[in-house]
């Protein structure tokens, strides 16, 4: 049986829209699936790498590395997503190409990043981890660090950086799917929402769905243990 | 072609309050954002403020806040712009002009406002 | 808020001559300036959005550089029409800011 949950939601375009949480219902009148999972129950994603789901990872990552940030041109705020969902004429979709893009390295000007931009985070103004040295980032969006430390300036001169940041990561089902949503539509969908990320590519979904004891490499699922504590 | 038809002048007594009226044509209303600016006589030009036709999200210049109040009717495409508690200060000539690309790159022909009692 | 200075605030310049008008922002804004041509009891008119990018239909004898907070405004050989008022316009934050305005008056 499914439980069905409507509600008028705040999405990323800032608009509420009416959106609908289907949950599977227990059978035997008990938990949810998800809360069965955290409990130790026998699901094969958590023991093992599940095909499907890695092809899923792998699909939502390709897509992200070809998103920028849209800023919405009413001051609304901004929020990570492809072009095709950025309006042309309401918002600005920062997205570096060409030579619009900052150097790679502040002391080699000749190499332009074509990967961002991404809203609140930029190698120019995190300052942890620092993007210099050997420890350059990558010109792929999908490789870059949780920035934990901000360069302390309230304007940057970036557009994507001074925006009113709308949407952030948000792990979706038992599948470990990930979206770039507002906070209340990922607490109405029983998501987990990641405060402290800018990308689906920085957290680790399945991770956090299966629970338990935390995977030694946050890609490969490791919890064999399962067999025995169902 | 694009239009922004704006509502004729206005003498008005202090105290009171005025609405100003700006018609689209030529183009899809909710697809722009519309801006209001301030223009005194003889002096420069002041931001008002934005409205978002499409899901009604207005931002205001904070010196503007209490003073203008904007909203748009999708079925008539048109934007309008309320001024209350008007005094002398308020006398201006006011602009509604269509965003794009953050700049304004089409303007009504401006409504005057004249507040004297 | 971000305030913009232009100057100057006017300038006698004769047919066929060139002109610069400058805008400093108080604070960086990128390339995010827009340049308009007022006439006498007129509406602005766009010239110049995202600070070099001539708007639709505008002569290209109107130009624009610079980013930061250091722009510049530039009509080289000017024609009886362009002696008008100009205005700068930071459109990177709100509330968007205009510069004071430069009037070109004819030598």
């Known amino acids: 049986a499914q439980h069905v949950t409507t509600q008028l939601v705040l999405r990323n375009k800032g608009v509420y829209e009416s959106v609908k949480y289907i949950q599977q219902e227990n059978f035997w009148i008990g938990p949810s699936s998800i809360d069965l999972i955290h409990l130790g129950a026998k699901f094969s994603p958590c023991i093992r790498k599940d095909q499907q789901i890695e092809q899923l990872v792998l699909r939502e990552r390709d897509l992200e590395r070809d998103s920028g940030c849209c800023v919405q041109n009413d001051h609304s705020g901004c929020i990570q997503t492809q072009r095709k969902d950025c309006s042309e004429t309401l918002a600005t979709f920062v997205k570096w190409q060409d030579d619009t893009g900052p150097p790679m390295d502040k002391s080699d000007l000749g190499q332009k990043r074509t990967s961002g931009a991404v809203c609140h985070q930029d190698p120019r103004t995190c300052e942890e981890p620092a993007s210099s040295g050997a420890h350059i980032w990558p010109d792929d969006i999908t490789k870059w660090p949780i920035c934990t430390e901000q360069a302390k300036s309230n304007r940057t001169g970036f557009l994507h950086m001074d925006c009113q940041i709308k949407g952030r990561p948000c792990c979706i089902s038992t599948k470990g799917s990930c979206e770039i949503t507002t906070r209340e539509y990922c607490e109405f969908m029983h998501g987990y929402f990641h405060e402290e990320a800018t990308l689906c590519s920085q957290v680790h979904c399945l991770d956090k769905v299966c629970g338990l004891l935390p995977f030694l490499n946050p890609e490969v699922p490791d919890q064999f243990y399962r067999l025995w504590l169902s | 072609q694009v239009q922004l038809q704006q509502s004729g002048a206005e003498l008005v007594r202090p105290g009171t309050s005025v609405k100003v009226s700006c018609k689209a044509s030529g183009y899809a209303f909710t697809n722009y954002l519309i801006e209001w600016v301030k223009q005194r006589p003889g002096q420069g030009l002041e931001w008002i403020g934005v409205?978002?036709?499409?899901?009604?999200?207005?931002n205001y210049n904070e010196k503007f806040k209490g003073k203008a109040i904007l909203n748009a009717d999708k079925s008539s495409s048109t934007a309008y712009m309320q001024l209350i508690s008007l005094t002398s200060e308020d006398s201006a000539v006011y602009f509604c002009?269509?965003?794009?690309?953050?700049?304004?790159?089409?303007w009504g022909q401006g409504t005057s406002v004249t507040v004297s009692s | 808020d971000i305030q913009m200075t232009q100057s100057p605030a006017s300038q006698s310049a004769s047919l066929g001559e060139s002109v610069t008008i400058t805008c400093l922002a108080s604070?960086?804004?990128?390339?995010?300036l827009a340049w308009y041509q007022q006439k006498p009891g007129k509406s602005p008119q766009l010239l110049i959005h995202a600070a070099t990018s001539l708007a639709d239909g505008v002569p290209s004898r109107f130009s624009g550089s610079g980013s930061g907070t250091k722009f510049s405004f530039k009509i080289s050989s000017l024609q009886a029409e362009d002696f008008v008022s100009y205005y700068c316009?930071?459109?990177?934050?709100?509330?968007?800011?205009f510069g004071g305005g430069t009037k070109l008056e004819i030598k």
């Open positions: 604070q960086t804004i990128g390339t995010w």
């Open positions: 409205i978002n036709p499409g899901s009604g999200f207005t």
């Open positions: 316009q930071q459109i990177y934050s709100s509330p968007y800011t």
């Open positions: 002009a269509r965003d794009l690309k953050r700049a304004m790159d089409h």
